[in-house]
């Protein structure tokens, strides 16, 4: 259970500056790159650069803008209705079921297996086997790969392995 | 075990209300945002809205803000969907969701969550 996700609370920041652009809320949310304000009358404007949103809301607090860790570079910067978008440097991959770091990508396939992919950002180098054409990904499935329903085909009722 | 039980699906007219429930078996529930998507037939899924971890602010999906609310009781382990002003457009397969890790704030794409509810139809007849 304690492995399943452990949420941050929003960094504590300033009530908007005077400055920044307010509107009304359209039934009770206001639009991407707002928030509300406390008293549900004004939407106020996203911070560039420093936070965003990014679907109508009524969020207090603009969300955070992600900082790319070393060794990810940023593809895109933060704007006020996107978050910065963070890719693995060259050489290294950050698998969809394992985001919290870059790993380095193989540089060679076992013997008797030839690479037929090559090392992305996303994915590691593709090797199968010279006589099957077989997949070897060169890696034991992590156990939340093993059981985590796809969208397309959830259990009845869902009942994963956490 | 991660298990959530969806409940509160039906057949409903078009105008009419309907509130979906999400009953989650995990502890960890009450520091984890929680998501609501849908699936039309033929169509992919998509997201309808998403509640911050501690139930104060969301995302709602254009097609639906004004008319759906995202609530969660973290004291019982439940997130609710109320869907006021239904439209026939709204017909679909609902489902509830938890993030498969904590890299995101408020996810609002289906890559980022792990963990699905079993679904519960949803049927707006005009």
């Known amino acids: 259970e304690s492995a399943l996700i452990t949420q941050q609370d929003l960094a504590p920041q300033q009530r908007a500056a005077p400055q920044q652009k307010r509107s009304s809320p359209s039934e009770g949310l206001c639009p991407p790159g707002h928030h509300i304000s406390e008293d549900g009358r004004d939407c106020i404007s996203c911070k560039y650069g420093q936070d965003y949103s990014t679907h109508w809301n009524d969020l207090l607090f603009c969300l955070r803008c992600t900082r790319c860790d070393s060794g990810e570079v940023e593809l895109s910067p933060c704007t006020t209705t996107r978050n910065t978008v963070c890719q693995c440097e060259e050489g290294t991959f950050r698998e969809e079921d394992s985001p919290e770091m870059c790993r380095k990508c193989r540089t060679g396939c076992p013997r008797g297996m030839v690479k037929v992919g090559d090392c992305t950002p996303w994915s590691d180098i593709e090797c199968v086997h010279k006589e099957s054409g077989t997949k070897h990904s060169g890696e034991v499935p992590a156990v939340e790969e093993t059981v985590t329903s796809s969208p397309g085909t959830p259990a009845s009722p869902c009942s994963l392995s956490g | 075990q991660v298990q959530l039980v969806q409940s509160g699906g039906g057949l409903v007219q078009a105008g009419g209300s309907l509130t979906l429930s999400c009953a989650a078996s995990v502890s960890t529930f009450g520091t984890s945002p929680v998501g609501w998507f849908r699936q039309a037939p033929g169509k992919e899924r998509e997201f309808v809205s998403a509640i911050r971890w501690d139930g104060v602010g969301a995302y709602y999906a254009d097609s639906v803000r004004g008319r759906f609310k995202n609530s969660k009781d973290n004291a019982k382990r439940t997130a609710y969907l109320q869907m006021n002003r239904l439209k026939p457009e709204d017909t679909a397969v609902y489902y509830c969701?938890?993030?498969?890790?904590?890299?995101?704030?408020?996810?609002?794409?289906?890559?980022?969550?792990?963990?699905w509810g079993q679904g519960t139809q949803v049927t707006v007849s005009s």
């Open positions: 969701a938890l993030p498969r890790r904590g890299d995101s704030e408020l996810p609002s794409t289906v890559k980022e969550y792990g963990y």
